[in-house]
């Protein structure tokens, strides 16, 4: 299953990056799982994951750095609290869980660049 | 003549970006001209240019946003005062001016990403 995502995204100076993950659904899925994985220096780590029912809100864990909304075959993902050291390739993985058949799609990744802001001068 | 430069550079939160432009000199040039061009939306504009004698300092115009140093066939370029709207592909053009023969080399460009910082809160 094909998954499309932008090649490059810049995090804002507040450390927030948003991108769209779009999948070409071969069937009429009602339950979808979206996972964001970060690849840097050939290491892959799971950033966040959410399962949602089509037409409903994505619900990530309470302590997750991700939030998102869905619209048809598009998922709008936002990752917060990013620092320069979090710069890397963020890969969108989509699984059509239900009803069968199961489909898996993995995007080529979005390179997120993060620049740490200069500290503001002390206000004396 | 081959010119090498990095594919991507992030400007600092102060709007400063530095990169190295390296050329494979076919001869023993004594006078070299370096030009930085910016390509965005298929428009190419000249950012800055400097001519230098090998072993000497690069001297850009006083009001130039560029500064630089040279070391052998490497030129270390720094561009200052960058804003988010200045994000684009910065191409390094190197000309071996003297002695003849004249050589021209153009790099593939360095994509410079610039993020505007959040304003600091007013200190009341």
């Amino acid at each position: 299953m094909h998954v499309a995502q932008p090649a490059v995204v810049l995090a804002s100076s507040r450390g927030i990056a948003s991108f769209v993950c779009e999948y070409a659904s071969p069937g009429k899925a009602t339950e979808v799982r979206v996972t964001v994985l970060r690849q840097a220096d050939s290491q892959v780590t799971e950033v966040c994951a959410a399962t949602y029912m089509m037409g409903n809100e994505l619900t990530f864990l309470d302590d997750s750095i991700c939030t998102g909304t869905s619209s048809g075959n598009q998922v709008n993902l936002t990752i917060q609290g990013l620092r320069a050291m979090d710069t890397g390739l963020y890969i969108c993985k989509v699984e059509l869980m239900y009803p069968p058949p199961y489909y898996l799609g993995i995007g080529n990744g979005t390179q997120i660049y993060v620049i740490d802001p200069e500290p503001c001068p002390d206000s004396d | 003549m081959h010119v090498a430069q990095p594919a991507v550079v992030l400007a600092s939160s102060r709007g400063i970006a530095s990169f190295v432009c390296e050329y494979a000199s076919p001869g023993k040039a004594t006078e070299v001209r370096v030009t930085v061009l910016r390509q965005a939306d298929s428009q190419v504009t000249e950012v800055c240019a400097a001519t230098y004698m090998m072993g000497n300092e690069l001297t850009f115009l006083d009001d130039s946003i560029c500064t630089g140093t040279s070391s052998g066939n490497q030129v270390n370029l720094t561009i200052q005062g960058l804003r988010a709207m200045d994000t684009g592909l910065y191409i390094c053009k190197v000309e071996l001016m003297y002695p003849p023969p004249y050589y021209l080399g153009i790099g593939n460009g360095t994509q410079i990403y610039v993020i505007d910082p959040e304003p600091c809160p007013d200190s009341d």
């Epitope: 799982r33 996972t35 994985l37 690849q39 892959v44 780590t45 799971e46 994951a49 864990l61 890969i91 993985k93 898996l104 993995i106 | -």
Partner: nanobody, 112 residues
Framework: QVQLQESGGGSVQAGGSLRLSCAAS????????MTWLRQAPGKGLEWVST???????SYADSVKGRFAISRDNAKNILYLQLNSLEIEDTGMYYC??????RGQGTQVTVSS
């Protein structure tokens, strides 16, 4: 190299039990959401169960109350306990996680 290897399948009578294992090499299972899938003869893949990095589990309605997903973090192995097996549970079972494609699978055959 990142690899997943399933084992533990076999032939069993309806109502019987099996425990499937998925051994991971090249990555730490507990850091990822891991999924069990199955494919019945002549059919497409079907999602069976998932365990996330925090340990939360979910199951397809068809196996709820009969199957249990778990993992051994020390051994880096994912398990699927299959109880009260039914003929419809026959198929090839696969594990999947992270960016890995699924393993080779292990065959489960349930007969009457």
């Amino acid at each position: 190299q990142v690899q997943l290897q399933e084992s533990g399948g076999g032939s069993v009578q309806a109502g019987g039990s099996l425990r499937l294992s998925c051994a991971a090499s090249g990555f730490t299972l507990s850091s990822y959401t891991m999924t069990w899938l199955r494919q019945a003869p002549g059919k497409g893949l079907e999602w069976v169960s998932t365990i996330n990095s925090g340990g939360s589990t979910s199951y397809a309605d068809s196996v709820k109350g009969r199957f249990a997903i778990s993992r051994d973090n020390a051994k880096n192995i994912l398990y699927l306990q299959l109880n009260s097996l039914e003929i419809e549970d026959t198929g090839m079972y696969y594990c999947q996680g992270g960016l890995t494609q699924r393993g080779q699978g292990t065959q489960v055959t349930v007969s009457s």
